[in-house]
């Protein structure tokens, strides 16, 4: 057993039908030594007296909230959380796995830029008595500073027959370099308390490795004369970082017909614009990713032909 | 990337291109490593980041645009004097810190040199015969530090006396392969930087 | 004490559907993850799916991807496999089973795929 | 396809020991617990070993796990006839838990 904070504690269970479970001794937080009686949660059945309580945590039942009380005056609360080992590894219900990029994936997270700011999201189709707090760090042993804000219900959708909700999370490296050459991965650990269900869930990455730029801005077109070639500019999104010849894009270039299964001409260029031939009722999409390092690429940023 | 590309001009500076070839080739190299040992601790995930130019060089610092500078995260700054007449400079004056980054960038080259001629040299003694460096690799290295042209010391090739455990270099391999793609990163940015101002 | 029974069992032809059940008693059946295993004739245990406690997360084996749904209703004390498109590979014994250090195996149901 | 490697077959004498190899890699037994099963015929197959080494209670010690590295075993000593039956490890692999990877099964037989 273990505290999560003041007054909330974690007895860890290894899970299975009929396990024989954890005993946990409880102390009221009091100078009195008589008259003490204990219930659990809204019950008014007393389990118990004395200045500790012996109980034996199995199942959810005997979590929840402990009070001690003397002649009706509530001394102090003890909440018991549960955190399940199945098998010899954490259980992982509250969170839905994205299973992108590989199995297991709980958590995402992504950068606009190299300036130490991230975002990371979730997501569960649990809508109430839910809580998740946030702490991040760079390296493990010494870590060094990361502030996150708090989680915020970010989107909610509908998949088959459940909803589905996302939560979000943005963070910043108290102290980060654009230039830098990561050595240390930044680690996320998100605490998520369902009802009296405890599991924790973390994340490890380089922020070079979680780039995604925005798409780039001002695209348009100029048509060249006596052609059907268009020269296609844009620019760097206001969002990447500076300076610009140091934090160099690629780009790639794509006119797409109407039709998805029309064949799509691609071009990759280092530059801010590039010439395309523009079919009738084609569009053409502009994407960038960092140009020495293969991350992800950005979102496609559009305009039509016409 | 196996699409057309518009390559840019190669531009007044002459490393650029070299830097270029540098990240592919390692790029390429890494890549080739992770699937050859693929049952060697050798991803990202798996592997120990180390930098073997860590106190001796210090290319990140010396190499800062200038518009970062004002960013105090930046400038961790080590003293650090480096020789300053490098024949990438030839075509423009240059400041006495571009020389010191470029003497940095040729210094973390050398470094990477010998320890990837070392590794070589016990890999070609392995029975299994696994996995060689790629020789394409070690001349863009060699292209690059010419390009660079800077007057050094040579570094002697380490030998060792006692018999390899090629497991451990294998995977020394792979840590020096991510460290060393992330140098080429860092190498190619300034490169690009330099040969825009 | 825990018990599982599995049910739904028998002979179907190649490309028709079969529905499993397996009926849990004597835990909260809502609070376990579970799994459905099958061995063939003569060959060894092969993991089919799993689903962790309100079925949102599940998980299956390749060789049963888009073909195979493991689902279940607490509510019912039943966990579900719903096969369709079956192969004659997918003739087995089929059992289900409770995650955790020390599980619980039901007796299993055959299932034939023949023509 | 399993993962998990064991022998097809071992045998022995009532009263003898013997033991069943299970070999995996780095991201199954080398990152995760290992159990064993015993499975008579026609029956399902029944928990032997779990965390590696833990018998459940009702599993005579006769029966005992290890774990190193990438691999695993189980020892039978004092081999009894009721002990022929197929016998599998199960571990997890860090990408795919929690698919469960059992091993390819050993028969072990009692010789009279």
């Known amino acids: 057993i273990w505290e999560l904070k003041k007054d909330v504690y974690v007895v860890e269970l290894d899970w299975y039908p009929d396990a024989p479970g954890e005993m946990v001794v409880l102390t009221c937080d009091t100078p009195e030594e008589d008259g003490i009686t204990w219930t659990l949660d809204q019950s008014s059945e007393v389990l118990g007296s004395g200045k500790t309580l012996t109980i034996q945590v199995k199942e959810f039942g005997d979590a929840g909230q402990y009070t001690c009380h003397k002649g009706g005056e509530v001394l102090s609360h003890s909440l018991l959380l549960l955190h399940k080992k199945e098998d010899g590894i954490w259980s992982t219900d509250i969170l839905k796995d994205q299973k992108e990029p590989k199995n297991k994936t709980f958590l995402r997270c992504e950068a606009k830029n190299y300036s130490g700011r991230f975002t990371c999201w979730w997501l569960t189709t649990i809508s109430t008595d839910l809580t998740f707090s946030v702490k991040s760090s760079r390296g493990s042993s010494d870590p060094q500073g990361v502030t996150c804000g708090a989680a915020t219900l970010s989107a909610e959708r509908v998949r088959g027959d459940n909803k589905e909700y996302e939560y979000s999370v943005e963070c910043q490296e108290d102290s980060a370099c654009p230039a830098a050459e990561e050595s240390l991965p930044i680690e996320v650990m998100v605490d998520a308390v369902h009802k009296l269900k405890y599991e924790n869930y973390t994340s490890s990455f380089f922020i070079r490795d979680i780039i995604k730029p925005d798409p780039p801005k001002n695209l348009q077109l100029k048509p060249l004369k006596n052609s059907r070639q268009v020269e296609v500019s844009w620019e760097y999104p206001d969002t990447w970082s500076t300076p610009h010849s140091y934090f160099s894009l690629t780009f790639c270039v794509q006119v797409q017909g109407k039709s998805k299964r029309e064949k799509k001409d691609r071009v990759f260029t280092d530059k801010t614009s590039a010439t395309v031939i523009c079919r009738k009722n084609a569009s053409i999409s502009v994407r960038a990713q960092d140009r020495y390092y293969s991350s992800s690429w950005s979102e496609w940023a559009s305009v039509p032909c016409s | 990337r196996n699409l057309p590309v518009a390559t840019p001009d190669p531009g007044m500076f002459p490393c650029l291109h070299h830097s270029q070839n540098l990240l592919r080739a390692v790029s390429n190299m890494l890549q080739k490593a992770r699937q050859t040992l693929e049952f060697y601790p050798c991803t990202s995930e798996e592997i120990d980041h180390e930098d073997i130019t860590k106190d001796k060089t210090s290319t990140v610092e010396a190499c800062l645009p200038l518009e970062l500078t004002k960013n105090e995260s930046c400038l961790n700054s080590r003293e650090t004097s480096f020789i300053t007449n490098g024949s990438c400079l030839a075509s423009r004056k240059t400041s006495f810190m571009m020389a010191l980054c470029l003497s940095s960038i040729y210094e973390d080259l050398k470094m990477y040199q010998v320890e990837f001629k070392t590794m070589n040299a016990k890999l070609l003694m392995d029975p299994k015969r696994q996995i060689f460096l790629d020789q394409n690799m070690l001349a863009v290295i060699d292209e690059l530090m010419q390009a660079l042209n800077f007057n050094s010391e040579t570094v002697p090739q380490k030998s060792s006396l006692e018999e390899p455990d090629f497991y451990k270099t294998k995977i020394k391999l792979c840590i020096l392969l991510h460290a060393f793609r992330i140098r080429a990163v860092t190498i190619d940015r300034v490169m690009s930087y330099l040969n825009a101002s | 004490q825990v018990q599982l029974v599995e049910s739904g069992g028998g002979v179907v032809q190649p490309g028709r559907s079969l529905r499993l059940s397996c009926a849990a008693s004597g835990f909260t059946f809502s609070s376990y993850g579970m799994h459905w295993v099958r061995q063939a004739p003569g060959k060894g245990l092969e993991w089919v799916a799993f689903i962790r406690v309100d079925g949102s997360n599940k998980y299956y084996a390749d060789s049963v991807k888009g073909r195979f749904t493991i689902s279940r209703d607490n509510s019912k004390n039943t966990l579900y496999l719903q096969m369709n498109s079956l192969r004659a590979e997918d003739t087995a014994v089929y059992y289900c089973?409770?995650?955790?250090?020390?599980?619980?195996w039901g007796q299993g149901t055959m299932v034939t795929v023949s023509s | 396809q399993s993962v998990l490697t064991q022998p097809p077959s071992v045998s022995g004498a009532p009263g003898q020991r013997v033991t069943i190899s299970c070999s995996g890699s780095?991201?199954?037994?080398?990152?995760?617990?290992v159990k064993w099963y015993q499975q008579l015929p026609g029956t399902a197959p029944k928990l032997l070993i779990y965390?590696?080494?833990q018998r459940p209670s009702g599993v005579p010690d006769r029966f005992s796990g290890s774990k190193s590295g990438t691999s695993a075993s189980l020892a039978i000593t004092g081999l009894q006839a009721e002990d022929e039956a197929d016998y599998y490890c199960q571990s997890y692999d860090r990408y795919t838990h929690p698919a469960l990877l059992f091993g390819t099964g050993t028969k072990v037989t009692v010789l009279a």
């Open positions: 089973k409770t995650h955790g250090s020390h599980d619980n």
């Open positions: 780095r991201s199954n037994i080398g990152s995760n617990t």
């Open positions: 965390y590696n080494d």
